[in-house]
């Protein structure tokens, strides 16, 4: 999927600091579906929009995470933003990237790839971005995408740009990125896995 995660992030990044604080407080008391736990208060209150998106998706997965986010936004009186979030979640996905067998028809993935689970940490902590780009070039990244990532000034902005392409990626594309990470920054993958 990936699309729902990005839609949640877009919505949360469009909240003011005061609205984000209110969102977190409402999240502490919003009714949850049976079988789902609540994000601990201590961790929740200190999070920025990116970390909160990752926490929502890791706790509730993408589909329910987006639904829950929309419910809280509605409860805050932000009906339009909630509607945009749900509309974005249900849009069709883009074309399959170069070099990987595309499925006969695109289907929403119910689960989260390691790459999706740890998006925020990868954006913050990957340093060997050029190596990743070379490993992915022609397999997952087009020339245009490769150049766009390289043009970014810092490693986090490079990674953020790289992640802007992942909603169109299938599972095997994400595996190729993960393989490149295992080869270039194995300690980081190990560390994230333990977390």
């Amino acid at each position: 999927m990936g699309r729902a995660r990005d839609a949640i992030l877009d919505a949360l990044e469009n909240l003011t600091a005061e609205e984000l604080k209110k969102f977190k407080l409402k999240l502490l008391s919003v009714p949850l579906r049976e079988g789902y736990g609540r994000i601990p208060r201590g961790a929740l209150l200190s999070m920025d929009a990116l970390d909160l998106t990752d926490k929502l998706v890791s706790f509730y997965l993408e589909t329910y995470g987006a639904e829950l986010t929309a419910n809280v936004l509605r409860d805050m009186g932000l009906q339009e933003m909630a509607g945009q979030l749900q509309a974005a979640t249900h849009q069709g996905s883009g074309a399959a990237p170069a070099g990987i067998q595309a499925p006969p028809q695109s289907a929403a993935k119910p689960g989260l790839h390691f790459i999706d689970q740890h998006r925020a940490a990868l954006i913050a902590r990957v340093t060997n971005v050029e190596w990743l780009l070379d490993a992915l070039y022609g397999k997952v990244l087009t020339d245009e995408q490769y150049q766009a990532v390289r043009a970014e000034p810092t490693n986090p902005s490079k990674m953020r740009k790289l992640f802007s392409f992942t909603p169109a990626w299938n599972w095997t594309c994400k595996d190729l990125l993960l393989q490149a990470l295992r080869e270039s920054q194995s300690y980081l993958v190990e560390d994230l896995e333990r977390s």
Partner: antibody, heavy 122, light 107 residues
Framework: QVQLVQSGAEVKKPGSSVKVSCKAS????????IHWVRQAPGQGLEWMGY????????MYNEKFQGRVTITADKSTSTAYMELSSLRSEDTAVYYC???????????????WGQGTLVTVSS | EIVLTQSPATLSLSPGERATLSCHAS??????LSWYQQKPGQAPRLLIY???NLHTGIPARFSGSGSGTDFTLTISSLEPEDFAVYYC?????????FGQGTKLEIK
Amino acid sequence: QVQLVQSGAEVKKPGSSVKVSCKASGYTFTDQTIHWVRQAPGQGLEWMGYIYPGDGSAMYNEKFQGRVTITADKSTSTAYMELSSLRSEDTAVYYCARPLYSYASYYWFAYWGQGTLVTVSS
Amino acid sequence: EIVLTQSPATLSLSPGERATLSCHASQNINVWLSWYQQKPGQAPRLLIYKSSNLHTGIPARFSGSGSGTDFTLTISSLEPEDFAVYYCQQGQSYPLTFGQGTKLEIK
């Protein structure tokens, strides 16, 4: 509990194709990758590729690229491995396998089918 | 592709003895290695993953160690049911590859 049940033994002529099935149960089929590993008589294990039923994407060992096709039918929770242009050296036991979990940073195979013997002989 | 070389090809020991099996990778695979046990007519069985993690239900006499290119599977005190073929597998890069196996036989 997780179970992978494979189709029965096959005898095939050189040049023909074989399609082996693997029916999964005990977990959400679309949440985990299914891999295919083969073992020639008295030999070691060889990874052929995998499919992620959640989106239908597949990855193959380049050694088999063009000859192997892995597919999945979500409605029956069944994965398939088709190998074409068979030759005698394709005689082997073919296993489907599921990782411990697919969301980790690796694939270790905790669950295996019982194996399907494919014999290629003229 | 990454080549895994197991040694020895055959290991002859008695029940109660300690077994040490080795797996050497042709390039650095960090800790991304697992071990399997296979008995005749059966599918492989996962013992150890990520070099040293014991899989659920596997007896504590099995242990794994190593990182980089050299790995070891140790069986502290052999039981009669441990005599089988053991394979290592790397999970670092595609294609995933296995070692050629070590046959552990009764002396």
